[in-house]
């Protein structure tokens, strides 16, 4: 049986200059093209290298644009979304939210950015009990000779 | 991702029309911004034309305006260049080009575009 995969979602208020190409992204979403079920928001779905966003490095690819210069992106339609980034202007204030993928449930199912899916301490605990145990059994065998 | 394969090039007398077709492979074709550019002999490539995700959104270089019509068909996953009154400028080999989502930016410059096909050649004597 696989874990259940939640996400930790985060917010960030992120400040973009336009430069001599723009912002250097791409969007989709809105009221009439929803990229996520029952959900119309904006999401980044990509980040044109050396870009003003790509060389910030704060916006990801999955990111969820709520508002720009302080304007809600809620139930725009898909091309407004688009001319409000284009007309935003020279500094451009984006509020994002991010998702964080993070694993709930049995260990070893885990997803592909972690094949084992058995965190570190998971392995050094049982091997430092083991080695503990042999030491104290090979020192009472000792005292015994 | 998403694999371009154009089609329909040949050779036309001037005055003549011809339509390009551009086939892509691969998912979520609808969220595409799709985009026609041309590459003259001795030239820079250029901006032909560009449709958003749902047949709108859509930009003509002023050289085609009028006589070019961009168009795509979701449902067969193609992009259309009907090119009419064509002149000899017009020679050159046409490339299909697409971005996943639509671009914050001007959608005209070739930056803006991360998938590319092999090209077709139009030549109009």
């Known amino acids: 049986m696989n874990g259940r995969v939640d996400y930790l979602v985060t917010e960030e208020e992120i400040n973009l200059t336009r430069g001599p190409s723009g912002l250097g992204f791409n969007i989709v979403g809105g009221t009439d093209q929803q990229y996520v079920s029952n959900d119309s928001g904006i999401y980044v779905s990509r980040i044109k290298e050396n870009g003003a966003a790509a060389l910030d490095g704060r916006l990801q690819e999955g990111d969820k644009i709520l508002s720009v210069n302080g304007q809600d992106l809620k139930n725009l339609l898909h091309q407004d979304a688009v001319d409000l980034f284009r007309n935003a202007g020279y500094a451009v204030s984006l509020r994002v939210q991010h998702r964080l993928q993070v694993q709930n449930g049995p260990i070893g199912h885990r997803g592909e950015g972690d094949p084992s899916g058995i965190p570190i301490f998971m392995v050094l605990v049982p091997v430092f009990a083991l080695t503990m145990v042999a030491a104290w059994a090979f020192m009472r065998y000792r005292q015994q000779l | 991702d998403v694999q371009l394969v154009e089609s329909g090039g040949g050779l036309v007398q001037a005055g003549g029309s011809l339509r390009l077709s551009c086939a892509a492979s691969g998912r979520a074709f609808d969220r595409y911004t799709m985009a026609w550019f041309r590459q003259g002999p001795g030239k820079e490539r250029e901006f032909v034309a560009t449709?958003?995700?749902?047949?709108?959104?859509?930009y003509y270089a002023d050289s085609v305006k009028g006589r070019f019509t961009i168009s795509r068909d979701n449902a067969k996953n193609t992009v259309y260049l009907q090119m009419n009154s064509l002149k000899p400028e017009d020679t050159a080999v046409y490339y299909c080009?697409?971005?996943?989502?639509?671009?914050?930016?001007?959608?005209?410059?070739?930056?803006?575009?991360?998938?590319w096909g092999q090209g077709t050649q139009v030549t109009v004597s």
């Open positions: 449709v958003g995700w749902n047949d709108n959104s859509i």
């Open positions: 080009a697409a971005t996943f989502g639509s671009p914050v930016d001007t959608p005209l410059d070739r930056g803006a575009y991360d998938f």
